[in-house]
Interface confidence: low
């Protein structure tokens, strides 16, 4: 530190507004105007009551992980810029963030950056023709019910559409003839006989994430003989099904990577 009366250099925190889909990484950049000899950089989130909650801290090229390992601070090569990232952002990560810097003694000074806003949006449902998700104020169970009913209705509509197309293209089908490839082939019996409509919803999130690691299946209406809705066995995305601590990418570095890494 050069002198006790050294002027403080401002901090910037960008972008001022950041929007990511849930499950994606959200990265802000905290920048120092110059590089003090010894300093601590803290990353904060503003709580609803305007309190600052510390997410992570950085000093002298070592990071002290906070309680939630999803929050990471990385110093960039230029030494002045720091990436502050949320690994696998969740809907409830939406909010106001900032960084703060502390010069160490003898001229201890504290400064905070301007605020920045993060918006984490729900992952877009597939296919794009899917009806829009219900407003956030709907409870998790109600939302699950709405999605279930919507799924059945879409299935019914598709089935009716297909029936209409078949009726138009193959008029004989309406007179009870077999619609299979060969008239000689007997009509297939069993579960595969009916057409199967695969509605790929991607990762359905029924907002029960906080209650259970794996959301229970939504209650489906009883009358579902019109279509079979197949949910493909896709692995869950880290931000949605896996706990933060199970993410390999979100693990704190091993002690060999550097000092100052503390056990939980």
């Amino acid at each position: 530190l050069d002198s006790p009366d050294r002027p403080w250099s401002p901090l910037t925190f960008s972008p001022a507004q950041l929007t990511v889909q849930e499950g994606e990484n959200a990265t802000f950049t905290c920048s120092l105007a110059d590089i003090p000899d010894s300093f601590v950089l803290n990353w904060y989130r503003l709580s609803p009551r305007n309190q600052t909650d510390k997410l992570a801290a950085f000093q002298e090229d070592r990071i002290e992980p906070g309680r939630d390992r999803r929050f990471r601070v990385t110093r960039l090569p230029n030494g002045r810029d720091f990436h502050m990232s949320i690994v696998a952002a969740r809907l409830n990560d939406s909010g106001i963030y900032l960084c703060g810097a502390i010069y160490l003694p003898p001229n201890t000074q504290i400064n905070e950056s301007p605020r920045a806003e993060l918006s984490v949006t729900e992952r877009t449902l597939e296919p794009p023709t899917q009806s829009p998700s219900p407003p956030p104020r709907l409870s998790g169970q109600l939302q699950g019910l709405v999605i279930g009913v919507t799924s059945v209705l879409v299935g019914v509509l598709l089935l009716l559409l297909l029936t209409w197309v078949l009726a138009a293209v193959f008029p004989r089908a309406t007179r009870g003839a077999c619609v299979c490839g060969s008239e000689d082939e007997p009509l297939k019996e069993g579960p595969d006989a009916a057409p199967v409509f695969t509605l790929d919803y991607g990762e359905l999130d029924f907002q029960w994430r906080e209650k259970t690691p794996e959301p229970p299946a939504p209650c489906a209406p009883e009358q579902t003989e019109y279509a079979t809705i197949v949910f493909p066995g896709r692995p869950a995305s880290p931000g949605r099904r896996a706990s933060a601590s199970s993410l390999q990418g979100a693990q704190p570095p091993s002690p060999e990577d550097g000092p100052g890494l503390w056990p939980p």
Partner: antibody
Framework: QVQLQQPGAELVRPGASVKLSCKAS?????SFWMNWVKLRPEQGLEW???????????HYNQKFKDKAILTVDKSSSTAYMQLSSLTSEDSAVYYC???????????WGQGTLVTVSA | DIVMSQSPSSLAVSVGEKVTLSCKSS????????????LAWYQQKPGQSPKLLIY???TRESGVPDRFTGSGSGTDFTLTISSVKAEDLAVYYC?????????FGGGTKLEIK
């Protein structure tokens, strides 16, 4: 001017508990970790642990995990260390010390002499 | 835990003499990412609390006389007092802040002849 005020002495019975205080002034209390260190003449200095006054996060030396509990009262800028199940081995001077960042202990209190005696 | 060893445990010197205190760690305190050694030196005078002298192994704390110099890297460190004064009578401790738990050396007691 940074100051850490600690009571001079505490006399306690074996098996009892004691809660030591450390009142901070002259700096932003919630900005820096508060550490606690034990000094016995023959054993030298031992680091007990530290607490972040900002959110009460704690890190302990495993040796003192079941002996000490570190807390803070932000409203009064005071850090506390409660020592339980005291024995003669716990007779020592206990210091609080501020830590700027994750580094050296910059400022120390005057220490509290704890004497465990029947 | 990182073990810190100091030597000698005590020594008596005359005013004006040069003194060298040694501190060794059981593992390197040098962090390759920033080439800094995570070691501090403290002075504890009789009846007083410890006082920070040196951090980052060689950075003198504000207000500390320039006769105190810290040096060394990795596992071997030295605190040198270029010309001892009577007020330097104290116990000197080294401490690593590289990893949890922070550990101190056993101390070197400096006595004045």
């Amino acid at each position: 001017q940074v100051q850490l005020q600690q009571p001079g002495a505490e006399l306690v019975r074996p098996g009892a508990s004691v809660k030591l205080s450390c009142k901070a002034s002259g700096y932003t209390f919630t900005s820096f970790w508060m550490n606690w260190v034990k000094l016995r003449p023959e054993q030298g200095l031992e680091w007990i642990g530290r607490v972040d006054p900002y959110d009460s996060e704690t890190h302990y030396n495993q040796k003192f995990k079941d002996k000490a509990i570190l807390t803070v009262d932000k409203s009064s800028s005071t850090a506390y260390m409660q020592l339980s199940s005291l024995t003669s081995e716990d007779s020592a001077v206990y210091y609080c010390a501020t830590q700027f960042g994750f580094s050296w202990l910059a400022y120390w209190g005057q220490g509290t002499l704890v004497t465990v005696s029947a | 835990d990182i073990v810190m060893s100091q030597s000698p445990s005590s020594l008596a010197v005359s005013v004006g003499e040069k003194v060298t205190l040694s501190c060794k760690s059981s593992q390197s305190l040098l962090y390759s990412s920033n080439q800094k050694n995570y070691l501090a030196w403290y002075q504890q005078k009789p009846g007083q609390s410890p006082k920070l002298l040196i951090y980052w192994a060689s950075t003198r704390e504000s207000g500390v006389p320039d006769r105190f110099t810290g040096s060394g890297s990795g596992t071997d460190f030295t605190l040198t007092i270029s010309s001892v004064k009577a007020e330097d009578l104290a116990v000197y401790y080294c401490q690593q802040y590289y990893s949890n738990p922070y550990t101190f050396g056993g101390g070197t007691k400096l006595e004045i002849k």
